[in-house]
Structure formats: C-alpha cells, structure tokens
C-alpha cells in the first residue's frame, strides 16, 4: 500500500461548548482529486470510526446529516471540527487520509490530536 | 435519468483541431468525473483521460499529451476534448464516460460516441 | 503501462447455453487495501460501451445475476450461465489500478 505522510496537531483542546477543530494536512504524491477522510478515536487501546467524508477537490467537505464533524478543505489541507464533545470523549483523534482517485490508491495516518475536553462546571444560582 | 450527450460527427482535415462536447443531465456535474476514451473503427478502447469538473483538473494518457485538452463549463454542465494536431489515425469514435465512486471509479454511464473522422 | 490480455478473441455461444471468457493483466490487480481493480464492459451493437462489472465480481445496477466475475490477482474470467441472444457483443475488461486506464483487446460474442 504506498503511504502518504499525514500530519495534524498533537494537543488541542475542545471549548467550553465542547467543540474542537484542527488542521489535517497530508502531502499528495499525485494529482489527488479525490479525497476520502476518515476521524478515528483511540481510546484504551480501542479504535472506533467517529466520521468520515469523500470530496473532491474544489467541492465541499460533505460528512452525513447526523454526523459530529464538519469540515473544509483547502488544498491538502482539511479542517476538521469535531462538535458535542463532552469530558468522556477525551482521547486520541486520528486522521486517515485516503487518495480515492486518480490511481494509484495511496493511504496516509496522522499520529493523532490528543483532543482534552473539560466538561463546563454548573453556574451557580444567583441572587440579584 | 443521466444522460451525456455528446455532439455531432466532424470531418477535419489532417492538422486541424476538433472539439467535442458532452452534455450531462439527470444528476450533480460536478459530483463526477468525466473521462473521455477514443474507439478507432473496429478496434477497442482507448482511455484519453479525466476532467474534475470542480476544479479542471485533469490527468491524461501520455500517448494523447500536448495534444488534447480537456475542460469544463459548469454553467451548462458540459463537458469538452478537444485534440489538436489531427493525423489519420485519429479518426475514431470519441466517448465521454462518468465515473461513479460507488462503483470504485468504474466508467457507469456513456455518451452515444462522436465520429470524428480525419482526411485530407 | 498495465497490459490486458483476453481470450478468445471471438466465442460463437449457443443460447441457453454457459460462456466464460478469460482476461489477464501485466501486474496484480489486488491491491493491499483488498481492492481488486479489474472492471468488465459489453458494448453491444452499434451502441455505447455499458458496465457490467466492477471490482472484479461486483455487478453494477440492472445487470442480471447470469452474469458473474471471479478471478485472482492477475487472471480473470467473466461467466455467463445461460446466454441470451440480447448478450452478443464485444466483452472487455479492464483496470484503474494505475493510470493510464487499460482495456483489452476485446472478446466477441456471437450466436452460432
């Protein structure tokens, strides 16, 4: 399988609304113009697909309707926000970038963002 | 129901240019790739090359470089090839294709094919 | 450049009868992502090529389960069970492992 290398930021921490974005940018060998990017988190050795999205160069970054991602891509750039985060989807988020088309089929994996997410404290009640 | 249809057959003399297009219809232009494949008479198929109608980029076989040129008119869905340089042997059958990413890039719907015939 | 090979060049079919007919390529079509990229096609008389089959043994929408397609890495076949008169025409396969896209030369089919 000829690999690509992929690279991403290692810390980003999500809001207080629970959002967090990073940048995965992958170095094309060829004239990728078909792109499929895939967010997996790895958590106590486990590794689950979060969401995944084909596009084709110079279109939206199209993820499904219930999806938690959205993103844009620029170039070999894609920017990915990953919403609804609560404290117990800390973990390590990895991007898979796959080079659809033209052939030759190529796949690169990023190290990961280890995405750190701190659920807001209540407010407290006030008097005025 | 999708459809690419694709202009008229052309009689050039050798060294002219010909310029071929390919209407689509029924689905999202730019969600596909559109290849194009030249069919000499009684012979088989030949792959000339893609256009990404987002972003006109395209790759090509090397055999037809320099001399074809492939581009897009998203307001009109349309796509062209056009060849440049015209020998005999380029008289053919030229096909347009749409690539289905479902079906792992295979070629899934055609234009009816354009004759383009060279002589002098 | 990915050099396909089929055979035979012409296959004369008896209607209700099976057909095979064979495809080779230079390299392996098996990629190590589990990707066969092999595709079969009929272009009919006087018409436009059409797909039969993708990723090797997929059949593309609308083609009917007579038709199937097996093979390995480099050699291929495409059976057809039982043939019918509306089958005839020139079969070819092809790959879109490597660029430029190839196909072969072309099996045609006929009734006896």
């Known amino acids: 399988c000829k690999a690509m290398h992929v690279a991403q930021p290692a810390v980003v921490l999500a809001s207080s609304r629970g959002i967090a974005s990073f940048v995965c940018e992958y170095a094309s060998p060829g004239k990728a113009t078909e792109v499929r990017v895939t967010v997996l988190r790895q958590a106590d050795s486990q590794v689950t697909e979060v969401c995944a999205a084909t596009y084709m160069m110079g279109n939206e970054l199209t993820f499904l309707d219930d999806s938690i991602c959205t993103g844009t891509s620029s170039g070999n750039q894609v920017n990915l926000t990953i919403q609804g985060l609560r404290a117990m989807d800390t973990g390590l988020y990895i991007c898979k970038v796959e080079l659809m088309y033209p052939p030759p089929y190529y796949l690169g994996i990023g190290n990961g963002t280890q995405i750190y997410v701190i659920d807001p404290e209540p407010c407290p009640d006030s008097d005025f | 129901q999708v459809q690419l249809v694709q202009s008229g057959a052309e009689v050039k003399k050798p060294g002219a240019s010909v310029k071929v297009s390919c209407k689509a219809s029924g689905y999202k232009f730019t969600d596909h790739f559109i290849n194009w494949v030249k069919q000499a008479p009684g012979q088989g198929l030949e792959w000339i090359g893609d256009i990404n109608p987002n972003n006109g980029g395209t790759n090509s076989n090397q055999k037809f470089e320099g001399r074809v040129t492939l581009t897009v008119d998203t307001s009109i869905s349309t796509a062209y090839m056009e060849l440049s340089r015209l020998r005999s042997d380029d008289t053919a059958v030229y096909y347009c294709?749409?690539?289905?990413?479902?079906?792992?890039?295979?070629?899934?719907?055609w234009g009816q094919g354009t004759l383009v015939t060279v002589s002098s | 450049d990915i050099v396909m090979t089929q055979s035979p060049l012409s296959l004369p079919v008896t209607p209700g009868e099976p057909a095979s007919i064979s495809c080779r390529s230079s390299k392996s079509l098996l990629h190590s992502n589990g990707i066969t990229y092999l595709y079969w096609y009929l272009q009919k008389p006087g018409q436009s090529p059409q797909l039969l089959i993708y990723?090797?043994?997929n059949l593309a929408s609308g083609v009917p389960d007579r038709f199937s397609g097996s093979g390995s890495g480099t050699d291929f076949t495409l059976k057809i069970s039982r043939v019918e008169a509306e089958d005839v025409g020139v079969y070819y396969c092809a790959q879109n492992l490597e660029l430029p896209l190839t196909f072969g030369g072309g099996t045609k089919v006929e009734i006896k």
């Open positions: 294709a749409r690539l289905r990413r479902e079906y792992f890039y295979a070629m899934d719907y």
């Open positions: 990723q090797m043994s």
